[in-house]
């Protein structure tokens, strides 16, 4: 069968039919349905939602919809023994206690099973001691404290403000600094945008609002007890002492009202500079300990959470491909939420639901995609990307042979200003071409394309007339597909204006106030931004599954490889003497990048000219495109991070959310001037250059003519 025979309708009409079927009103309805009660991973409520989604996807017309369950390590507060932090006086009496729960939002006062704020996977403990304020608890913040200010965090409880980097990195840094406990808080400087009211009157964080979240350092391992393998019925589980990524010190999150009570009494050193000051009416003294009258008072943490092996459920829906059923395009997003999930994840899940409905409608009319589309509703994303990772571990052999692309679908919005896309360079041209065909939802851009409004509001720093597309980092369910398996991946959502809103994420992230009303009243009353995101995500899936030649452009990889090589070389050249002393050369890397560029160019020429009616040649060329991302995988992984195997991209070692290019070389160079054995350190830099150069060259050769 030719592609058009298989699909019954011309490809252009298919895409239009698919996009026209997507309706804002449906997304709104689905969001409401998904957000009326909490859907915490491992709970009965979330299991029921999984079954509801399974049933609805079947009704929508998918060929099959199955639940895939795993028994993974989760973490919950003790219902009868709540977590809190105290200020204690010299007699040990508690003279102040942090809140036990967030003030419930209007209309939700009688909802049961709202999990109180906690740091998932915190160990139990009741440490007491002096407080040290560590700013954002980034690597550079601890450098400033320890190296410049000579402040020792050993045996101290540190208090850090949320923002800038993943909370797990903050905890890891605190542990390495010798802290015995961590308090995380949301400062209004980061979570309260000027001129906007706090919820329920606006989208800002009230003082009693608290950000939940896991504090793991899994580095892509998935379930902490079964790294590398699925947590199935016959799994061998590690003991808790050998579990991957668990923190070793108690951690607890608080809001800014409670933080004020702790920070106002701080003494010791003044903040080193204005970048350490937030917006509270406190001095932001670093400590250690309290000032003057309060110097005998200490801080005590009371953490009683428990880690429990708990069953989770993914929903996996299949729409079989008519021509290449053994080629998989995956659209996945998580279903579990910390509380109501008004934005995270249900604004994404509602979009996936509507995309499934639209595909199902086309299928009922006799259409099928060329390739198989898999739809996934992941569980336990909030507990460390567990549902997606376990499923990928269970199906890794199929995925590495058949996986064409993965499109992520968590929160559809984190603002309502413009589009934000992070993806593999292979998808740049797909995203550009698609957004040129879609209408912009933005005010002032009526009748203009999404590409135009996006480019105007978020221009590329390198290429004029093009929009910014960012590197993939982690902190979401694409991680295992991209960083471990090397499947081309991308994500899209509507975001805020980063120029004017310097706060981290969106203010109500992971709080009880992330409700349906937050979205419907303040972010997207017409659900037009949700619809646009559905068109982008759905359109990408449609093209990836239905285009005769895969919509990947390998030349864009060549461009970024040169950019990344230049960047890492310039970092290394900050140490010209050592480079000379230890004979460090980047020639092999630049040579490999040059070869990649030439071979990619020739491949693209052949791609224009080959006989697309020859199914064998078509399949061969498509396989070279599909396997290009795979070719950047090093089976040995990155140093000390075996599940991060992509040589070009990895989550930053200092911030899981951010992507780092040539991460092996970058980490080898990081803080190299402080290494005790410079010869060994520069030897590792040379080894990483070798690995990177080899990988780029090997990837280039996969694009050469096969014989």
């Amino acid at each position: 069968k030719s592609s058009n025979e298989a699909t019954n309708i011309t490809p252009k009409h298919n895409m239009k039919a698919f996009l026209d079927e997507l309706k804002a009103e449906n997304i709104k309805k689905f969001l409401y349905n998904f957000t009326q009660i909490p859907h915490l991973a491992g709970t009965e409520q979330n299991f029921q939602l999984a079954k509801q989604i399974q049933s609805q996807w079947k009704e929508f017309g998918l060929d099959s919809v199955e639940l895939a369950h795993y028994d993974v390590l989760l973490s919950y507060p003790n219902k009868t023994h709540p977590n809190y932090i105290s200020i204690i006086n010299e007699d040990g009496n508690e003279i102040f206690n942090t809140s036990l729960f967030e003030p419930p939002p209007p209309g939700y006062e009688n909802v049961s099973d709202i999990v109180p704020p906690f740091s998932a996977f915190s160990p139990q403990g009741m440490p007491e001691g002096d407080l040290v304020y560590v700013n954002y608890a980034r690597t550079e913040d601890f450098f400033k404290l320890e190296r410049d200010m000579k402040i020792n965090c050993s045996g101290k409880i540190v208090i850090a403000r949320y923002g800038k980097v993943f909370r797990g990195n903050k905890v890891k840094n605190a542990q390495l600094a010798g802290a015995k406990g961590v308090i995380l808080y949301s400062d209004p400087a980061d979570y309260f945008a000027p001129g906007v009211k706090s919820y329920p009157d606006g989208w800002n964080l009230p003082g009693g609002g608290v950000q939940r979240g896991n504090i793991l350092n899994l580095n892509g391992a998935g379930d902490p007890l079964t790294p590398g393998y699925p947590a199935n019925e016959y799994a061998y589980r590690r003991g808790i002492a050998e579990a991957v990524g668990l923190p070793s010190i108690p951690v607890h999150p608080i809001g800014y009202y409670d933080a004020q009570k702790l920070l106002e009494k701080m003494g010791g050193s003044a903040p080193p500079d204005s970048s350490w000051r937030g917006s509270l009416k406190v001095p932001y003294n670093v400590g250690p300990g309290f000032t003057g009258n309060f110097s005998t008072q200490k801080v005590k943490m009371h953490i009683h959470s428990t880690n429990e092996v708990t069953r989770i459920y993914n929903v996996i829906g299949t729409l079989r491909g008519a021509v290449e059923p053994d080629r998989y395009v995956i659209l996945g997003g998580h279903r579990d939420s910390w509380v109501f999930g008004g934005i995270d994840p249900q604004s994404g899940a509602a979009v996936v639901h509507e995309i499934v409905r639209s595909f199902g409608t086309l299928k009922k009319e006799g259409w099928r995609p060329r390739r198989t589309i898999l739809f996934a509703s992941w569980d336990a994303e909030e507990f460390g990307l567990l549902g997606s990772t376990e499923w990928a571990e269970e199906n890794s052999r199929l995925l590495q042979e058949r996986g064409v692309a993965y499109i992520n679908a968590d929160s559809s919005i984190e603002g309502n200003y413009t589009l934000r896309v992070d993806c593999t360079p292979l998808m740049y041209s797909l995203v550009h071409n698609l957004t040129k065909e879609l209408k912009s939802p933005d005010e002032g851009f009526e009748g203009k394309s999404l590409y135009e409004s996006w480019t105007k509001k978020s221009p590329s720093p390198e290429f004029s007339g093009m929009p910014r597309i960012s590197k993939l980092g982690s902190g979401n369910d694409f991680e295992v597909f991209f960083q471990r398996l090397g499947i081309a991946s991308g994500r899209a959502r509507y975001t805020k204006n980063w120029e004017t809103n310097k706060f981290s994420g969106y203010p109500l992230y992971h709080s009880v106030y992330e409700t349906y009303e937050l979205v419907e009243k303040f972010y997207d009353p017409m659900f037009k931004y949700h619809l646009t995101v559905a068109q982008v995500r759905g359109g990408m899936v449609f093209e990836l599954a239905n285009s005769i030649v895969l919509p990947f452009d390998c030349r864009d990889y060549a461009v970024v490889l040169r950019k990344y090589a230049d960047k890492i070389y310039s970092i290394s050249m900050k140490h010209p003497q050592e480079m000379k002393t230890y004979s460090v050369s980047f020639d092999s890397l630049f040579s490999a990048v040059k070869n990649f560029t030439e071979i990619a160019s020739k491949f693209s020429e052949r791609l224009q000219d080959f006989d697309k009616s020859n199914p064998i040649v078509l399949r061969m060329m498509n396989d070279q495109l599909m396997f290009l991302e795979r070719a950047f995988i090093d089976p040995l992984g990155l140093p000390d991070r075996p599940f991060y195997r992509h040589v070009i991209y990895a989550p930053s070692s200092h911030n899981k959310y951010a992507g780092e290019s040539f991460p092996g070389i970058y980490d080898a160079l990081f803080d190299i001037e402080s290494k005790v054995d410079p010869s060994k350190a520069w030897g590792e830099v040379k080894r990483q250059i070798y690995v990177a150069a080899f990988t780029v060259q090997a990837a280039a050769e996969t694009l050469s003519e096969v014989a």
Partner: antibody
Framework: QVQLQESGGDVVQPGRSLRLSCAAS????????LHWVRQAPGRGLEWVTL????????YYADSVKGRFTISRDNSKNTLYLQMNSLRAEDTAVYYC???????????????WGQGTTVTVSS | YELTQPPSVSVAPGQTARITCGGN??????VHWYQQKPGQAPVLVVY???DRPSGIPERFSGTNSGNTATLTISRAEAGDEADYYC???????????FGGGTKLTVL
């Protein structure tokens, strides 16, 4: 509409006990800190005690510490003040008041009840 | 911690009344102001130094710096006659503190 209504005021003898109640309506009771403030005849406002929205913190004026206990029942939308070992100087109009936000410390009291009168006299 | 208010302030109708509230380094604290008319419960007129609750006329404003907070009532009216109290939270004693009150007379 947002309302606080105190009750339980009475004439009592010194050394006796009394419990005041404050019934709330028209707002999300469990989300706000609450205070008791009193005003002796012809005198200014005197703060008595506060309780945080979740009951985790309670603070008392030195003049009532050890004798008065503040509590709340979020399921009944009611605030209480248990007054023991009453003295003549406790004679006053007792107001309950809600904070503008959940935090009971740094923020103002935006809704007040009409007050209930406690008279301590032999 | 103590807050000091003048016992009384007089103002002619249409003129501006200023009521002060003194306290050591009061500028570092959030100050709230209440109006109380005879036989009635107090009413919040300014909170967090200078913010006005809904329903309070724009004529009421506040400032706070150094050792003095000030409540300003511009274009005073007869209906503004009342006792006015300032209030702060004293974090060193964990107490709410009220000023002694100021009787405003509109002549």
């Amino acid at each position: 509409q947002v309302q606080l209504q105190e009750s339980g005021g009475d004439v009592v003898q010194p050394g006796r006990s009394l419990r005041l109640s404050c019934a709330a309506s028209g707002f999300s009771f469990s989300g706000y800190g609450l205070h008791w403030v009193r005003q002796a005849p012809g005198r200014g406002l005197e703060w008595v005690t506060l309780i945080s929205y979740d009951g985790s913190n309670k603070y008392y004026a030195d003049s009532v510490k050890g004798r008065f206990t503040i509590s709340r029942d979020n399921s009944k939308n009611t605030l209480y003040l248990q007054m023991n070992s009453l003295r003549a100087e406790d004679t006053a109009v007792y107001y309950c008041a809600k904070t503008t936000v959940s935090d009971p410390y740094y923020y103002g009291m935006d809704v007040w009840g009409q007050g209930t009168t406690v008279t301590v006299s032999s | 911690y103590e807050l000091t208010q003048p016992p009384s302030v007089s103002v002619a109708p249409g003129q501006t009344a200023r009521i002060t509230c003194g306290g050591n380094n009061i500028g570092s604290k959030s100050v709230h102001w209440y109006q109380q008319k005879p036989g009635q419960a107090p009413v919040l007129v300014v909170y967090d130094d200078s913010d006005r609750p809904s329903g309070i006329p724009e004529r009421f404003s506040g400032t706070n710096s150094g050792n003095t907070a000030t409540l300003t009532i511009s274009r005073a009216e007869a209906g503004d006659e009342a006792d006015y109290y300032c209030q702060v939270w004293d974090s060193s004693s964990d107490h709410v503190v009220f000023g002694g009150g100021t009787k405003l007379t509109v002549l």
